[in-house]
């Protein structure tokens, strides 16, 4: 009769985390009499996974009835697989004795564990940045196995190329993490833009995971100011408006100054939203020209989103007063200038 062989038909088995792994093993003979043991690894540090004869192995069940008299199938199922279970498993036949002695081993089955990556988390810079500036976004995903993974960046559906990605650890681990940093150049139209990090992994069956960041949380579009003089509303009164255009976010405070002295301060409230997500706002000031002996410098000063104030000025000539309503001769717009006020 031919000598017993231990057959492990699967060289490798891949299982998703949380599932059960079936490790196949058959023997070709009932002789010699003796139990089967399963080990993870080989050599003096191998770990006993299952002993047919004795012991308690709560995660291991036999696939067939191993206690049957003529049973030659010693396949096992290991439940609730985690990445820590990866390794090479050996089915080993022992010869009955005192003690039992190892008789023959199977060739081993390598168990690899597939674990899904966590949903990618995208985070942007701590402080807002203005258009034309380059900002960095990071994307992180954890807990996946095997190590091979693909990460892509998109801005509004367009793939980005300026990014660096690391998978850690460099060596072997039960599971891995990915960290990527992408550089994005902001434009004035980016209030409604999204940055997307897309992660593809063997466990996702071609349906990648995505993490997003809205550029509305990153961008600051500074306002443009325009100060204009409106037709006279009444005798000795001039209406001056400050148009604050294309700003984001909404947080804005406007101060009117007459010859450098604060006249009124207000906070933007009833703003209008542009298609690109930026806001417009208008403030007006009624100036009593007769109260001034000399020319008046009117300044619209805007502090946007906690940034240093920007301003626009308008000179009102008071040398000749308007004769009738609607006349624009006495208060000509003699030009404006823009300056920072610190």
């Amino acid at each position: 009769e031919e000598e017993l062989q231990v057959i492990q038909p699967d060289k490798s088995v891949s299982v998703a985390a949380g599932e059960s792994a079936i490790l196949h093993c058959t023997v070709t003979s009932l002789i010699p009499v003796g139990p089967i043991q399963w080990f993870r690894g080989a050599g003096p540090a191998r770990e006993l996974i299952y002993n047919q004869k004795e012991g308690h192995f709560p995660r291991v069940t036999t696939v067939s009835e191993s206690t049957k008299r003529n049973n030659m199938d010693f396949s096992i199922s290991i439940s609730n697989i985690t990445p820590a279970d990866a390794g090479t498993y050996y089915c080993v036949k022992f010869r009955k004795g005192s003690p039992d002695t190892e008789f023959k081993s199977g060739a081993g089955t390598e168990l690899s564990v597939r674990a899904k990556p966590s949903a990618p988390v995208v985070s942007g810079p701590a402080a807002r940045a203005t258009p034309q500036h380059t900002v960095s976004f990071t994307c992180e995903s954890h807990g996946f196995s095997p190590r091979d993974i693909t990460l892509k960046w998109f801005k509004n559906g367009n793939e980005l190329s300026d990014f660096q990605t690391n998978v850690d650890p460099v060596g072997e681990s039960v599971s891995y993490s990915i960290h990527s940093t992408a550089k994005v150049v902001l434009t004035r139209e980016d209030v409604h833009s999204q940055v997307i990090c897309e992660v593809a992994h063997v466990t996702l069956q071609g349906d990648p995971l995505r993490g997003t960041a809205n550029l509305s949380e990153t961008i600051r579009v500074p306002p443009t100011l325009e100060v204009t003089q409106q037709p006279v509303r009444a005798e000795n009164q001039v209406n001056v408006t400050c148009q604050v255009r294309k700003f984001y976010p909404q947080r804005l405070q406007l101060t009117w100054l007459e010859n450098g002295n604060v006249s009124r301060t207000e906070t933007a409230s009833t703003v209008t939203e542009n298609k690109d997500g930026t806001y417009n706002w208008m403030s007006w000031l009624l100036v009593n020209v007769s109260a001034h002996r000399d020319d008046v410098k009117l300044t619209c000063q805007v502090e946007h989103d906690g940034q240093p104030a920007v301003s626009k000025s308008h000179d009102l000539k008071v040398s000749a007063h308007p004769k009738e309503q609607g006349s624009n001769t006495a208060a000509e717009n003699t030009g404006s200038n823009e300056r920072n006020i610190y």
Epitope: G43, P44, T101, E102
Partner: antibody, heavy 122, light 112 residues
């Protein structure tokens, strides 16, 4: 193909601790034993100990009280620490990979580092 | 501990001629599975040792077929069918059945 590279100080003072690191490149840590072996000048090979990928360690009984081998799979490195060194610990120290195919024994030390000379002297 | 004893300790050889080295272990290296846990190594001058034979008789990857290992139990032999100049160095036998791993004292092979 797998390569091993030892690193660490070449000179250690008596009574101090010898620390060596072996970096594994081009291969897997899993399913192998990672060994330290030394060779005193003009003498034969002496096994110090090894560590399996699951973290279990085995040491030469005469060195056991002074030796610790550790494994950092995340960096693909394993290390040797030997305390209270004397001149008798002067040797070329090799890191090596030991194969285990099945069974209780091992299947040859098939990959060796180039060796690093450690001199114990004040 | 298993003690490994080699002979001869020095072996002058002629290129093209055969050579053999003996190794004896203080206990059997034949395991119950029928596997023999005996390895042979060659350490060329100024180099690290390299594995020649494992399992008593299996040649390691890349080892020329002029090297062969035989024996079982406690007595083992390494044979070189035709010695070449590059074979000079120290040959070691080692047991891998149990810890501590142990090596023979080494056999120094040099050209006559």
């Amino acid at each position: 193909q797998v390569q091993l590279q030892e690193s660490g100080p070449g000179l250690v003072k008596p009574s101090e601790t010898l620390s060596l690191t072996c970096t594994v490149s081009g291969g897997s840590i899993r399913d192998y034993y990672w060994s330290w072996i030394r060779q005193p000048p003009g003498k034969g090979l002496e096994w110090i100990g090894f560590i399996y990928y699951n973290g279990r360690t085995f040491y030469q009984s005469s060195l056991k009280s002074r030796v610790t081998i550790s494994l950092d799979t995340s960096k693909n490195q394993f290390s040797l620490k030997m305390t209270s060194v004397t001149a008798a610990d002067t040797a070329v120290y090799y890191c090596a990979r030991v194969r285990a195919y099945s069974g209780i024994g091992l299947d040859g030390t098939d990959v060796w580092g180039q060796g690093t000379t450690v001199t114990v002297s004040s | 501990d298993i003690v490994m004893t080699q002979s001869p300790l020095s072996l002058p050889v002629t290129p093209g001629e055969p050579a053999s080295i003996s190794c004896r272990s203080s206990q059997s290296l034949l395991y119950s599975t029928g596997y023999t846990y005996l390895d042979w190594y060659l350490q060329r001058p100024g180099q690290s040792p390299q594995l020649l034979i494992y399992g008593g008789s299996s040649r390691a990857s890349g080892v020329p077929d002029r090297f062969s290992g035989s024996g079982s139990g406690t007595d083992f032999t390494l044979k070189i069918s035709r010695v070449e100049a590059e074979d000079v160095g120290v040959f070691y036998c080692g047991q891998a059945l149990q810890t501590p791993l142990t090596f023979g004292q080494g056999t120094k092979v040099e050209i006559k």
